[in-house]
Interface confidence: medium
């Protein structure tokens, strides 16, 4: 009714001292490798000489922080980041930062960025949209307040606002162009 | 360990104006955002702006002509203040760290304030 | 902006219990937080971006979602867990919102 050598599972590391023989009811916990998070029980015990429990260690990593338009990251590049790890940004001048300066890896997600925005207020060309253009010629630059307006492309039905507007240096949001069969 | 309080006067006069202050220990406010929000007796929670690790800060629209928020990361102590308060700002006041995805994760314990003459 | 609606906003319960309260979303976001609160203290992290447990928290909480329904479950509920439960969200696009509560009382 012993157990002899402990089974294997990806990514896992058996703790305390590795025996020849498990009697019966001896539990064994496992920890996950660097990176990876346990999904479920740690452990695995033996009854009637076999191994039962089956640890999962997962992946929760993360890599590539997100890209923050006018911003550089100031903090150390890696390859990959553990759960937890924060990745810190700077805006370049002229721009100012809005939102968390950092993003943090959380379980193999990153967490919303910043946003650097003109400081005047001013908004930089209208984001494009699937389908439609705006109506305007468009501009390097917007002033505070300043508005564009979208039209879509033949056979496609405008949904949202046509209008969109300059506010604290962001524009409001666009409008989609929808094909009538999927409104 | 990481800690929040919150302090001020428990009563102030209509028209005048709030002002709190959280003194943190624990973490900078160099690396770390701090929020404030409040909740009116009996009600739920009203988020009333935050101040980042920069020195930025966000504000409630529907507060934003009346709140200050500020920082001294030399005394650990970000301040909150609301002007022309009238009874309807009687609340419970929370400051809180930022976590990231506009989460929080570690709270003051509340102060208490009443708008009344 | 974005209106966080919580149903049930109360909800009686026994000690045992699996109980699950509703976060729904005016309009399509990311991710949603979760927060406990008892009579006359600050409230208390429970769940971070939809589904990642806050430290500390016991493994009988979970949360899941996405687009505009979220949902907090108690798998089986304990003595220590009657409180307030409120849903919460942020986008750089919309003010800070919390959802109205939910009131969990005993049975």
């Known amino acids: 009714t012993d157990c002899l050598s402990l089974p294997s599972f990806e990514n896992a590391i058996p703790m305390g001292e590795k025996k020849d023989v498990y009697k019966a009811g001896e539990q064994v916990t496992y920890t996950c490798a660097t990176y990876y998070k346990m999904d479920g029980a740690s452990n695995v015990t033996c009854i009637n000489s076999r191994w039962t429990g089956r640890p999962t260690c997962r992946d929760t990593s993360c890599v590539n922080p997100p890209t923050v338009q006018n911003a550089y990251i100031v903090s150390r590049q890696m390859s990959k980041y553990p759960s937890g790890e924060r990745v810190r940004y700077q805006c370049r001048s002229p721009y100012e930062m809005f939102g968390d300066e950092e993003v943090m890896c959380l379980n193999g997600n990153w967490t919303e960025p910043p946003q650097c925005k003109d400081s005047t207020g001013k908004c930089g060309p209208p984001p494009p949209i699937d389908n439609g253009d705006i109506t305007s010629f468009p501009l390097s630059v917007y002033a505070p307040a300043s508005s564009v307006e979208y039209q879509c492309q033949n056979l496609y039905q405008l949904e949202g606002n046509k209008r969109i507007t300059c506010r604290n240096g962001q524009w409001s949001e666009p409008p989609k162009c929808l094909h009538p069969c999927v409104i | 360990q990481v800690q929040l309080q919150e302090s001020g006067p428990g009563l102030v006069k209509p028209s005048q104006t709030l002002s709190l202050t959280c003194t943190v220990s624990?973490?900078?406010?160099?690396?770390?955002?701090v929020y404030w929000i409040r909740q009116h007796p009996g009600k739920g929670l009203e988020w009333i702006g935050v101040?980042?690790?920069?020195?930025?800060?966000e504000y409630n629209p529907s507060m934003k002509s009346r709140v200050t928020i500020s920082k001294d990361t030399s005394k650990n102590q970000v301040s909150l203040k609301l002007s022309s308060v009238t009874a309807a700002d009687t609340a419970v006041y929370y400051c809180?760290?930022?976590?990231?995805?506009?989460?929080?994760?570690?709270w003051g314990q509340g102060t208490s304030v009443t708008v009344s003459s | 902006d974005i209106q966080l609606t919580q149903s049930p906003s109360s909800l009686s319960a026994s000690v045992g219990d699996r109980v699950t309260i509703t976060c729904r979303a005016s309009?399509?976001?990311?991710?949603m937080h979760w927060y406990q609160q008892k009579p006359g203290k600050a409230p208390k992290p429970l769940i971070y971006?939809?589904?990642n447990l806050a430290s500390g928290v016991p493994s009988r909480f979970s949360g899941s979602g996405s687009g505009t329904d979220f949902t907090l479950t108690i798998s089986s509920l304990q003595p220590e867990d009657f409180a307030t439960y409120y849903c919460?969200?942020?986008?750089?696009?919309?003010?800070?919102?919390f959802g109205a509560g939910t009131k969990l009382e005993l049975k």
């Open positions: 809180a760290r930022n976590f990231g995805n506009y989460a929080m994760d570690f």
């Open positions: 624990g973490f900078s406010l160099t690396n770390y955002g």
């Open positions: 101040i980042w690790s920069g020195g930025t800060t």
């Open positions: 309009t399509s976001v990311t991710y």
């Open positions: 971006a939809s589904s």
């Open positions: 919460q969200h942020r986008s750089s696009s919309n003010p800070l919102t």
